[in-house]
């Protein structure tokens, strides 16, 4: 499989799985934009939620995870057309009867306010002004994220945790 | 969300989304092991296939994509218990009536030989000796991958392709 746009490009050397030499500067790839400590890719084309998840994954990234209202607002400010919607990494877990981020954490009640049904096959998208649920099979744009963390050169393994 | 294991660690600077300063050395993160030009993470816990896909994605990686029989053998050689199975990034696409990798390519007939049903909600796992299909809702361990590509220092955006 050819690496897709947005890989971390590196020089291969053997026998270095546990060393911790790290670069002190890494930029967002072409087509991605830096927003605070993340690189975001706003897709132009559309996909069902599952395909969007897979697309971000094969780009070695994640569907957008939103930490708080400030991050939601920052992201929404980058959406320049109020008619456009983007899948994020949040869907309804039927077994747990709760909204669940793809990293396994549950939506906390004071985070996003979701308009729409909380039921099986419901996934969450954001627009310029709101957060909605919709059937996961609906085709929409999506947002992938890569997190950037602050380090300089030699770092302890804790930087990976 | 706290950055999960396996992020690209960087020094944040603004206004540099299109520059292409790249590190010339990047190692597999702690807990990951280098196998040829990939870093692999063998999970310890278990998950349904969809959750495994999501987990790899939030680690900014992909469920394992296997290019050929050699890579399959190399990966299986790392499985030290014949009773343990790992989800990979391959499932059955009902609409396309074919086994499909999560990067969108179809399983070629001379690649892996899958034992088990090719039907809706069938996902693929590997063991020490074989490749099987199973209901995607079954909880199993899984393997995430990050690809490493060869570059040195200043590079053109082509290194991202």
């Amino acid at each position: 499989q050819k690496p897709s746009i947005g890989k971390c490009s590196v020089d291969i050397q053997q026998n270095r799985t546990k060393t911790t030499e790290r670069p002190d500067l890494l930029n967002c790839p072409i087509y991605w934009q830096q927003v605070q400590e993340k690189c975001l890719l706003f897709s132009h084309t559309v996909n069902p939620w599952n395909n969007s998840l897979a697309d971000c994954s094969t780009k070695e990234s994640s569907l957008l995870l939103i930490q708080d209202k400030d991050e939601l607002t920052r992201t929404q400010n980058l959406i320049h057309d109020k008619a456009i919607s983007f899948w994020i990494g949040l869907n309804f877990s039927l077994s747990e009867k709760n909204w669940k981020w793809i990293n396994g954490s549950f939506l906390s009640s004071n985070d996003l306010k979701i308009t729409g049904d909380a039921k099986e096959n419901s996934c969450v998208y954001i627009s310029q002004t709101s957060v909605y649920s919709e059937y996961c099979s609906t085709e929409m744009k999506w947002i992938c994220q890569k997190e950037l963390t602050l380090v300089r050169n030699k770092v302890s393994p804790d930087s990976w945790l | 969300q706290k950055p999960s294991i396996g992020k690209c660690s960087v020094d944040i600077q603004q206004n540099r989304t299109k520059t292409t300063e790249r590190p010339d050395l990047l190692n597999c993160p702690i807990y990951w092991q280098q196998v040829q030009e990939k870093c692999l993470l063998f999970s310890h816990t278990v998950n349904p296939w969809n959750n495994s896909l999501a987990d790899c994605s939030t680690k900014e990686s992909s469920l394992l994509l296997i290019q050929d029989k050699d890579e399959l053998t190399r990966t299986q050689n790392l499985i030290h218990d014949k009773a343990i199975s790992f989800w990979i990034g391959l499932n059955f696409s009902l609409s396309e009536k074919n086994w499909k990798w999560i990067n969108g390519s179809f399983l070629s007939s001379n690649d892996l030989k899958i034992t088990g049903d090719a039907k809706e909600n069938s996902c693929v796992y590997i063991s020490q000796t074989s490749v099987y299909s199973e209901y995607c809702s079954t909880e199993m361990k899984w393997i995430c991958q990050k690809e490493l590509t060869l570059v040195r220092n200043k590079v053109s955006p082509d290194s991202w392709l």
Partner: antibody, heavy 121, light 107 residues
């Protein structure tokens, strides 16, 4: 080999129909939105239509809206363009094109060789 | 729809010359611009994407610049194989639109 191969072009009378096909190989066809682009003899490039990777969303240039239908069969790695009510001004070489990245509609890094459609009585 | 205006429509130049082609969008498109080269009887070939990124395999004598509404394709030292027609294309919004083309001819 990574390639796109169009077929189905030919001579057709005004008001007639043709169905173009584009067979893809060597890449993960089902993850890419795909487009048709045409070029009238001696003229420039004109985007005609696009379809999402899963096939549920389609777009058309105003000049062909209501007459052309784009579709795809991901199980066959094939893109189609059904052209009805053809006019003389639809005469062109028709190319299918793949975008550089699976998140994009455009920036076409792979083109077919093209198939010529001639509309004439 | 976003209109893309290319200039000049044709240019005569010699091998070794520096050639500059401009493309103007009728509204801002950030850096969502690509450049293609087309030779007679052949399909277009992607040269530049995202306004300034060189496509894999394209010689470094080709470069792109600009953002917003004004963009430039530069061939630093024209080679015999560069005589062709060049098109810009915006990828900011649908419908995708192309410039009218610039034919680079031998002087």
């Amino acid at each position: 080999e990574v390639q796109l191969l169009e077929s189905g072009g030919g001579l057709v009378q005004p008001g007639g129909s043709l169905r173009l096909s584009c067979a893809a190989s060597g890449f993960a066809f089902s993850t890419y939105a795909m487009s048709w682009v045409r070029q009238a003899p001696g003229k420039g490039l004109e985007w005609v239509s696009a379809i999402s990777a899963a096939g549920g969303t389609t777009y058309y240039a105003d000049s062909v809206k209501g007459r052309f239908t784009i579709s795809r069969d991901n199980s066959k790695n094939t893109l189609y363009l059904q052209m009805n009510s053809l006019r003389a001004e639809d005469t062109a070489v028709y190319y299918c094109a793949k975008p550089l990245d699976s998140s994009l509609w455009a920036d076409f890094d792979l083109w077919g060789r093209g198939t010529l459609v001639t509309v004439s009585s | 729809d976003i209109q893309m205006t290319q200039s000049p429509s044709s240019v005569s130049a010699s091998v070794g010359d520096r050639v500059t082609i401009t493309c103007r969008a009728s509204q801002g498109i950030d850096s969502w611009l690509a450049w293609y080269q087309q030779k007679p009887g052949k399909a277009p070939k992607l040269l530049i994407y995202a306004a300034s990124s060189l496509q894999s395999g394209v010689p470094s004598r080709f470069s792109g610049s600009g953002s917003g509404t004004d963009f430039t394709l530069t061939i630093s030292s024209l080679q015999p194989e560069d005589f062709a027609t060049y098109y810009c294309q915006q990828a900011s919004v649908l419908p995708i639109t192309f410039g009218g083309g610039t034919k680079v001819e031998i002087k």
